[in-house]
């Protein structure tokens, strides 16, 4: 019993004076309290509890579940306590079947005993089976098995208690052990697409996956640099023990201009935080924007192949495509296909193949793109590299030789002659006239250049060569002529053409 | 006449670094995509990189991705390969390769790439 | 990544004789595949584009043909020159080029 000490207030005192008090079941429990502030007595076990204003507390005739903690109380809220165990060989146990453990925490099997004399107080397996090797646990009497630091695997473990009785073991109700799990990582934070793009008054809705051990994980949109609730609707799922899937979906019925910007999908729990943002641009109309791969002034060589080849931007995505020469629409030889296959992308690539170009297909090609809202185009100007070609080579009745050569560049024309029977020219003659004959047109065709000489300066038997070249080649004509007396004879031309 | 002569091939240590030049003729780069290719001693041909001169868009090979660098200079009508921390498995002969019509239709003489301590 | 399988590794054959060597795709593709031949010491050579056409300057004895995603190559009189390696090459929109493993085409 408490020390009095005076002028202090002192606990009540309880006869029987002793912690812990045996009796049989059907026996009568008496217990009395003094203190001249008794206030009440307090019973509990397990979940209950029960109140008596008397000083006297009288059960008549015991039963297993009068075992409890006897608790008086004083004005000045001071206690004290007794332990009653109503032995009964009936029951054992008294039992409180749920069983809840929070991993790496320890719990209470709460099966405290109605006798402490019974032995081997400790945990069994359901069925027979062993139970996990690691698990560790330390019995009371009153309060029950406490199982050490909870581990996730022990999730739905069946165990009784047991004890043993007369050299028998004695098993109480089964418990099943759910246990909750310690947040051992961030959630898992997924997005249904990293950025979405919208017209204005299209639906914007967008789907944030959460993944963690349990739901006591929290979540929530947010929109960046702003504080406004945003709505969402919510679905989940356990799929397994541990595995429990959250889906926050974010809509905007009708989306502006304005709603552009970057949302966060956060989701938290004690070990930390996790996000994801998906950005929404929302324009007012769809767009094409076109970049070309290579330069839209192509020089390609005679007999050789080329692509013409574009990148292009599209939203909504591209409806009619085209490759047009000549007013001529292509209807193969060109291929159209998405740069990437993510659902999202607005990129495309259109590559019209040109084979064995002649000198004639020069000229201006158009890839032409429209959707649903907007229509472009872009032109390549296509330059054929081609070597001379001499047209004409003629002696003109005013005495002149001329020549006529076309090709890709502009031709240079220059003249040599060759005296008797040689056949290198190499003493150069300067041209009386050179034209360029059809500049005024577009210059994607051959250009034609005329060059001519005045043959009235060549007094010698001899040969006189017309010599066109450019970047590509060179080609030559040649003019032999005679002299009978004073008089020239008949100016015969022929080529040699030299690659 | 189309021609590509690649230079700047030699021995080079492990982790080293090296640049080869692709210089063309008889045609403008700036109108085709060029490539690089390489073939190890004895074994097939490995497409390597490419560029779009014009545009400046690139594309890598797995294998060399953020080692190697494609670059071009359309006034010097060349193209490059900036190759750095240079591995042995990275020996081979490169050839630098004219595309047109998803094929290489012109081809360089190669250059021979050595990399070894 | 499409992947081009080329068969065989390597055969043996006479002067006159047809030859053939296949490549298959991994999956569908376009008709975007080239055939190349390549001779020891030397870089390779297109001998086919697009599948079936046959690029400027080849011999007619070339060509090329397709069965879903099987491509053929036909040397219908094989002659002294073409003794060499043939390779396959692919391209696809989003793998970029591949080529085959080479076939080696000797002397029997």
């Known amino acids: 019993q408490p020390s009095v000490s005076p002028g202090e207030p002192s606990p009540p005192s309880i006869h029987p004076g002793k912690s812990d008090l045996i009796v049989r079941v059907g026996d009568e429990i008496r217990l009395l309290c003094t203190d001249p502030g008794f206030v009440k007595w307090t019973f509990e076990i397990l979940d209950e509890t029960n109140e008596n204003k008397q000083n006297e507390w009288i059960t008549e005739k015991a039963e297993a579940t009068n075992t409890g903690k006897y608790t008086c109380t004083n004005k000045h809220g001071l206690s004290n306590s007794i332990y009653v165990f109503v032995r009964d060989p009936a029951k054992l146990f008294l039992v409180d079947r749920s069983l809840y453990g929070k991993e790496d925490n320890d719990t209470l099997v709460r099966c405290p005993l109605t006798d402490p004399e019974v032995t081997n107080y400790s945990l069994k397996g359901c069925q027979g089976k062993p139970l996990p090797k690691d698990l560790r646990f330390i019995p009371d009497p009153k309060a029950g098995i406490m199982i050490k630091s909870v581990k996730r695997a022990y999730h739905r473990l069946c165990l009784h208690c047991s004890v043993d009785q007369e050299g028998k073991s004695v098993l109480s109700e089964k418990f099943i052990l759910k246990v909750r799990p310690a947040f051992k990582a961030v959630p898992v934070v997924s997005v249904s697409k990293a950025s979405y793009l919208l017209r204005e008054g299209e639906e914007f809705t967008v789907t944030c996956t959460i993944k963690d051990v349990s739901s006591s994980v929290y979540s929530t949109w947010k929109r960046e640099n702003s504080q406004t609730k945003l709505q969402e609707k919510y679905n989940s799922w356990h799929h397994g023990d541990f595995n429990y899937e959250r889906q926050a979906t974010l809509t905007i019925s009708s989306a502006r201009v304005n709603d552009s910007g970057v949302f966060m999908c956060y989701a938290n729990n004690t070990f930390g935080s996790a996000n994801v943002t998906t950005t929404l641009e929302v324009v007012d109309k769809g767009f094409i924007n076109i970049f070309p791969m290579i330069n839209t002034t192509v020089f390609v060589n005679d007999g050789e192949n080329v692509d013409l080849i574009v990148e292009y931007e599209a939203f909504p995505k591209p409806e009619h495509q085209q490759w047009i020469y000549m007013n001529r629409t292509f209807t193969d030889k060109w291929e159209d296909y998405p740069k990437s296959e993510n659902e999202s992308n607005i990129r495309y690539v259109s590559e019209l193949h040109l084979t064995r170009l002649k000198g004639t297909e020069g000229g201006t090609y158009t890839f032409l793109v429209s959707n649903s809202d907007v229509n472009a185009a872009i032109a390549f100007n296509v330059y054929v590299n081609t070597k001379p070609e001499i047209l004409t080579y003629d002696r003109l009745v005013n005495g002149m030789l001329q020549c006529v050569a076309a090709g890709f560049p502009e031709p240079t024309i220059d003249w040599y002659f060759c005296p008797g029977t040689e056949q290198r020219c190499s003493a150069s003659v300067l041209p009386v006239d050179v034209q360029t004959l059809n500049s005024s047109g577009p210059p994607f065709g051959k250009l034609v250049v005329q060059s001519s000489i005045d043959s009235s300066a060549f007094k010698h038997n001899g040969t006189v060569e017309c010599k066109a070249y450019n970047d590509v080649g060179k080609t030559s004509a040649y003019f032999n002529f005679a002299f009978k007396g004073n008089n020239k004879e008949q100016i015969h031309p022929h080529t040699l053409f030299t690659p | 006449e189309v021609q590509l002569v690649e230079s700047g091939g030699g021995l080079v240590q492990p982790g080293g670094s090296l640049r080869l030049s692709c210089a063309a003729s008889g045609f403008n780069i700036s109108s085709y995509s060029m490539h690089w290719v390489r073939q190890a001693p004895g074994k097939g041909l490995e497409w390597v990189a490419s560029i779009y001169p014009y545009s400046g868009y690139t594309y890598y090979a797995d294998s060399v991705k953020g080692r190697f660098t494609i670059s071009a200079d359309t006034s010097k009508n060349t193209a490059y390969l900036q190759m750095n921390s240079l591995r042995a498995e990275d020996t081979a002969v490169y050839y630098c390769?004219?595309?047109?019509?998803?094929?290489?239709?012109?081809w360089g003489q190669g250059t021979l790439v050595t990399v070894s301590s | 990544d499409i992947q081009m399988t080329q068969s065989p590794s390597s055969l043996s054959a006479s002067v006159g004789d047809r030859v053939t060597i296949t490549c298959r795709a991994s999956?569908?593709?376009?008709?975007?595949v080239a055939w190349y031949q390549q001779k020891p010491g030397k870089a390779p050579k297109l001998l086919i584009y697009s599948a079936s056409s046959l690029y400027s300057g080849v011999p007619s004895r070339f060509s090329g043909s397709r069965s879903g995603t099987d491509f053929t190559l036909t040397i219908s009189s094989l002659q002294p020159e073409d003794f060499a390696t043939y390779y396959c090459?692919?391209?696809?929109?989003?793998?970029?080029?591949?080529f085959g493993q080479g076939t080696k085409v000797e002397i029997k």
């Open positions: 390769a004219r595309y047109v019509y998803h094929a290489l239709d012109y």
């Open positions: 090459q692919q391209w696809a929109v989003h793998s970029l080029i591949t």
């Open positions: 999956q569908s593709v376009s008709s975007a």
